[in-house]
């Protein structure tokens, strides 16, 4: 495989990682898909300093980021542990609410106006933010 | 100049497999995610697939999902459509076209037909 | 899956006036929504992404507008080589999925 070792046009460079910042909403898994298609994933955030400079980014909009509990226990979708990693839940949070009335409980992780996170229904066309990291190998299979 | 040119479409027997390929110059491959669209004669656009730009991720729509497979070689510039157990309804013209951000497909090739029939 | 309805399915004009289509998506794709143009025999091609930005190199004849569900693409003043079929696709979620086609063609 190849390594890259720029980021892509529109995408902003931080700590070895690329990052892009949409800007129209999608679904959380949607917006999952979005982030492979690019060949990257949406942003896992390992600590604050990571936390702040997304947050800058993004302003005061809720922004999907690649944490849920779809499955059951909480998970970054890049396989970074959740139970040791960085956190930054808004108070009583994450509650997995069902009094919002769309069915089921609340899923999804994002960034509220304040940067802080918040769980909720993973339908919401939300904004959300891939990542990938420089110096990564790409998996290029190899053609049958 | 970017372009995109498909080939290896013809006439094929219901149960039998073709492979299409799409040979892109113009721009960098790598980094582009890359899709088939195939119109029935006389009918409109189907989305049939979507390959990331290292080939890591894919897509299908329901209707060819586990009997076709999307690639690629980076090396070569060329994106591949395998096309196994093929029916009467695959029939088409085949254009692999180009994904940019927006998912929409900015550049289109003249595309090929695929003839399914006994 | 999502689907994208356009009307008319056909319109006939002249050169010179001015031609709307709709298209409805089933459920909300916020803005993800493009136009396409195709002419008889020959490759679609792209107009106009994100439900009102035009492509590089199209004529400002061509716009688009709509948010949620429903969307119009508007060609202000038809030109020759405006008779055509036009496709919406939406862009929000997988499978990708275009409306049926609108054919625009001479009165």
């Known amino acids: 495989g190849s390594e890259r070792t720029c980021c892509p046009v529109n995408w902003v460079e931080h700590e070895r990682s690329c990052y892009w910042f949409s800007r129209s909403g999608k679904a959380w898994a949607d917006a999952d898909n979005y982030c492979r298609l690019e060949d990257a994933h949406l942003v896992v955030v390992t600590s604050w300093e990571e936390q702040k400079f997304v947050q800058h980014h993004i302003g005061p909009v809720n922004t999907w980021m690649g944490l849920h509990d779809q499955n059951g226990p909480w998970k970054w979708v890049d396989g970074t542990d959740y139970e040791t990693g960085f956190k930054n839940w808004r108070p009583e949070q994450p509650d997995d609410w069902y009094g919002h009335g769309l069915g089921g409980g609340e899923d999804c992780a994002h960034f509220t106006d304040d940067g802080r996170w918040n769980d909720d229904v993973c339908q919401r066309p939300y904004r959300w933010v891939c990542e990938t990291e420089l110096d990564k190998a790409s998996q290029e299979p190899p053609l049958l | 100049e970017v372009q995109l040119l498909e080939s290896g479409g013809g006439l094929v027997q219901p149960g039998g497999s073709l492979r299409l390929s799409c040979a892109a110059s113009?721009?960098?491959?790598?980094?582009?995610?890359m899709n088939w669209v195939r119109q029935a004669p006389g009918k409109g656009l189907e989305w049939v697939s979507a390959?990331?730009?290292?080939?890591?991720?894919?897509f299908y729509a329901d209707s060819v999902k586990g009997r076709f497979t999307i690639s690629r070689d980076n090396s070569k510039n060329t994106l591949y459509l395998q096309m196994n157990s093929l029916r009467a309804e695959d029939t088409a013209v085949y254009y692999c076209a180009k994904r940019t951000p927006y998912d929409v497909f900015d550049i289109w090739g003249q595309g090929t037909m695929v003839t399914v029939s006994s | 899956d999502i689907q994208m309805t356009q009307s008319p399915s056909s319109v006939s004009a002249s050169v010179g006036d001015r031609v709307t289509i709709t298209c409805r998506a089933s459920q909300g794709i916020t803005s993800w929504l493009t136009w396409y143009q195709q002419r008889p025999g020959k490759a679609p091609k792209l107009l106009i992404y994100?439900?009102?930005s035009l492509q590089s190199g199209v004529p400002s004849r061509f716009s688009g507008s709509g948010s949620g569900t429903d969307f119009i693409f508007t060609i202000s003043s038809l030109q020759p080589e405006d008779f055509a079929t036009y496709y919406c696709?939406?862009?929000?979620?997988?499978?990708?999925?275009f409306g049926q086609g609108t054919k625009v063609d001479i009165k």
């Open positions: 390959i990331s730009g290292s080939g890591g991720s894919s």
């Open positions: 113009g721009f960098t491959f790598s980094s582009c995610a």
């Open positions: 994100d439900t009102s």
């Open positions: 696709q939406q862009g929000n979620s997988f499978p990708f999925t």
